[in-house]
């Protein structure tokens, strides 16, 4: 087992800094993903005028992006740790198909798009270990996801650009809400 340099493995002690707690590490993971989203949004906004567009409603009809609602127990009023954690994990699982869609949408940020996708998978792993009620978490149907992906990829260029913008914006909002909620847990 890894121990700080020069210490005996029979007596594991922390190095100069304390070992990361579950809450600290989850917090860092979300901030890592948010930094990745910022990098991707930069490319999206530079490439097209989607970030200032007022025609978002047109594309939003095709999307069913996860959103935090009052009933999810993640807001300060009516906060419920267990309900909220289930919502966060379920929402992240639902976002995975949209993150898959993003994989071919970036020219100069291909590696960053992959990092956002993979770091989200890692975050799900961390949160699932934290959750007590894993039975309440519904995993999206792979067949439904596959047909949604096909549908999104068949859109015209303008709608694809708008979809990319909306996914990044919604995912950012969802993660920010999750971060606030998890800090109360």
């Amino acid at each position: 087992a890894p121990v700080p340099p020069g210490e005996d493995s029979k007596d594991v002690a922390a190095p100069h800094r304390q070992p990361l707690t579950s809450s600290e590490r989850i917090d860092k993971q979300i901030r890592y993903i948010l930094d990745g989203i910022s990098a991707l949004r930069k490319e999206t906004c530079n490439k097209s005028n989607m970030c200032e567009s007022s025609k978002e409603a047109l594309a939003e009809n095709n999307l069913n992006l996860p959103k935090m609602a009052e009933k999810d127990g993640c807001f300060q009023s009516g906060f419920n740790e267990e309900t909220c954690l289930v919502k966060i994990i379920t929402g992240l699982l639902e976002f995975e198909v949209y993150l898959e869609y993003l994989q071919n949408r970036f020219e100069s940020s291909e590696e960053q798009a992959r990092a956002v996708q993979m770091s989200t998978k890692v975050l799900i792993q961390f949160l699932q270990k934290k959750a007590k009620n894993l039975d309440a978490i519904t995993t999206p149907d792979p067949t439904t996801n596959a047909s949604l992906l096909t549908k999104l990829q068949a859109q015209n260029q303008w709608l694809q650009d708008m979809t990319t913008h909306l996914i990044l914006r919604s995912f950012k909002e969802f993660l920010q809400s999750s971060l606030r909620a998890l800090r109360q847990m």
């Epitope: 890894p2 070992p19 990361l20 990098a39 770091s119 270990k129």
Partner: nanobody, 124 residues
């Protein structure tokens, strides 16, 4: 664990942690051959699971994480006599800033925790 293996053989090293959760840390594997400097041979990040291999082990060694067991393993195939040495696993937090450089992971100063090492001997 380590041990004696014949050239061309395989061995799997596993790294677990005591007193903290390995899942939350980037993990690197290092080795020290007799009379040589310690060298970084492979690593895996904790943030996005990127992996890195030194040229000397590329295509023969595979690093992986197991979240169920909170371990990181190094699968070593097609072993050569020059793979002989003491193998160490180390854990650190060098990967928590988006855009980190994965190839920098083989610098031993990047790690906070080290294990005591396990001897691997490749000989017929």
């Amino acid at each position: 664990g380590g041990g004696l293996v014949q050239p061309g053989g395989s061995l799997r090293l596993s790294c677990a942690a005591s007193g903290f959760t390995l899942d939350y840390y980037a993990v690197g594997w290092f080795r020290q051959a007799p009379g040589k400097e310690r060298e970084g041979i492979s690593c895996i990040s904790s943030s996005d699971l990127k992996t890195y291999y030194a040229d000397s082990v590329k295509g023969r060694f595979t690093i992986s994480r197991d979240y169920a067991k909170s371990t990181v393993s190094l699968q070593m195939n097609s072993l050569k006599p020059e793979d002989t040495g003491v193998y160490y696993c180390a854990a650190g937090t060098w990967d928590l800033k988006f855009g980190y450089n994965i190839s920098a992971c083989v610098g031993s100063y990047e790690y906070d925790y080290w294990d005591q090492g396990t001897q691997v001997t490749v000989s017929s």
